[in-house]
């Protein structure tokens, strides 16, 4: 029995619903009474959802899963996972048995976009060329961990004197704080780019220092 799942991970945004696709080819005369369908977490073996002997056995996963009962007889064993959380990320095994059996694992990749970065400057007044300033770029509630890039007004990457920290909150979402220490020129723009590697989403923030006053676009 061939069980088919997508090769690529299913990407789902936190808080949305995701469908983990799984299908099999039923034989002629197939009856749901003969079907055993089990969704389990691949690594821990935790039961997620099951269908046995013609009956949906229900969700064993925080009551956030559902099958597509009207489609089972056509070989659609997909699982709907509601209100996706960071903790749901991982591999799910779809196992089907009728006369024969088969299984396949599908990966769920959870993602959340990062907020537009806020920029802070320290010190933030009486700045002169040659002063060393600390520019902090903060972006919130993204997943997975971000990639952070700094550049100057000419697009030249700034890699030295950058310290980036990422801390997960209770939901597993990351807050990113990246600090650039730079010696001021006569004027200049400093940009920070926070990239979500899964969504390929970039969030930009910049600060322009033009003597007095500074602007934060």
């Amino acid at each position: 029995l061939e069980v088919q799942v997508p090769e690529d991970p299913v990407v789902a945004l936190v808080g949305t619903d995701a469908t983990l696709c799984c299908s099999f080819s039923p034989e002629p005369g197939f009856s749901l009474a003969q079907l055993n369908l089990i969704w389990q977490l691949t690594d821990t073996k935790q039961l997620v959802h099951s269908f046995a002997e013609g009956q949906d056995q229900g969700s064993a996963y925080a009551n956030r899963t559902a099958l597509f009962p009207d489609l089972l007889a056509q070989g659609n064993a997909s699982l709907r996972l509601q209100r996706v959380r960071v903790a749901d990320e991982g591999s799910f095994t779809c196992f089907v048995s009728i006369r024969d059996f088969g299984s396949a694992a599908v990966s769920l990749q959870v993602a959340a976009p990062y907020s537009k970065p806020s920029m802070t400057l320290e010190p933030n007044k009486d700045l002169r060329p040659g002063d060393t300033v600390t520019i902090t770029c903060s972006s919130y509630r993204g997943y997975p961990e971000a990639e952070v890039f700094w550049q100057d007004g000419q697009g030249v990457p700034l890699t030295g004197n950058v310290t980036t920290s990422q801390m997960a909150n209770e939901q597993g979402l990351f807050d990113v704080h990246s600090v650039l220490r730079v010696v001021l020129g006569a004027n200049g723009t400093y940009s920070c780019l926070v990239r979500n590697p899964v969504l390929q989403q970039d969030a930009h923030g910049s600060v322009t220092i033009t003597g007095q006053p500074m602007t934060f676009p």
């Epitope: 029995l1 003969q34 089990i38 389990q40 196992f95 006369r99 059996f101």
Partner: antibody, heavy 120, light 110 residues
Framework: EVQLLESGGGLVQPGGSLRLSCAAS????????MTWVRQAPGKGLEWVAD????????LYADAVKGRFTISRDNSKNIVYLQMNSLRGEDTAVYYC?????????????WGQGTTVTVSS | QSVLTQPPSASGTPGQRVTISCSGV????????VHWYQQLPGTAPKLLIY???ERPSGVPDRFSGSTSGTSASLAISGLQSEDEADYYC???????????FGGGTKLTVL
């Protein structure tokens, strides 16, 4: 007559390897999942591994996962159990079994078993 | 993973009815079916009951199976000396747990 005949058992040192074979006859071998079950001396039955009809999906008991490999050759009507990194606790009689028409209905035909002894 | 619990031993006299229990059949992971195997001394196991109560061809109707709640039972009526054997219950526990057997019950015909 439906028959299963195991072979390949014997005495092997800890850490060694052994390959068991189970030759099937009397039924359409390529249509049925197959199972290996073992029984340690004086103990009960313990499931070891399953393989589906085409050989594309395999299942293993935690105790043997990563050490044992179940495979089949549908052209020869044989199912194999490759056992590596053998331990004392693998000492048992190993049975192969054929499933009923529906996989979850159990195993209806069993071989006579082959004895594996792991000892130094 | 569930554990199927059987009494280690049971006994009866010829002609009697004996029952062997198998508890712990609570899983929603796989099939809810319980199967029973008979293993005569020195021989391979033989399927006695499948899908809780069905008998394969060739198995006498003296053997019957039933389920109730989280327990399954094998009943043997009109006990005969050739019924002296080990009896195992089994169920299927899903893709990642496989087949689970009870510890076995040794039936002695007195």
């Amino acid at each position: 007559e439906v028959q299963l005949l195991e072979s390949g058992g014997g005495l092997v040192q800890p850490g060694g390897s052994l390959r068991l074979s189970c030759a099937a006859s009397g039924f359409t071998f390529s249509s049925y999942p197959m199972t290996w079950v073992r029984q340690a001396p004086g103990k009960g039955l313990e499931w070891v591994a399953d393989i589906n009809s085409g050989g594309g999906t395999t299942l293993y008991a935690d105790a043997v996962k990563g050490r044992f490999t179940i495979s089949r050759d549908n052209s020869k009507n044989i199912v194999y159990l490759q056992m590596n990194s053998l331990r004392g606790e693998d000492t048992a009689v190993y049975y192969c079994a054929k499933h009923l028409d529906y996989y979850s209905y159990g195993m209806d035909v069993w071989g006579q078993g082959t004895t594996v002894t792991v000892s130094s | 993973q569930s554990v199927l619990t059987q009494p280690p031993s049971a006994s009866g006299t010829p002609g009697q009815r004996v029952t062997i229990s198998c508890s712990g059949v609570t899983s929603k992971i796989g099939s809810k079916y319980v199967h029973w195997y008979q293993q005569l001394p020195g021989t391979a196991p033989k399927l006695l009951i499948y899908r809780n109560f069905e008998r394969p061809s060739g198995v006498p109707d003296r053997f019957s199976g039933s389920t109730s709640g989280t327990s399954a039972s094998l009943a043997i009526s009109g006990l005969q000396s050739e019924d002296e054997a080990d009896y195992y219950c089994a169920t299927w526990e899903g893709a990642l747990n496989g087949w689970v057997f009870g510890g076995g019950t040794k039936l002695t015909v007195l």
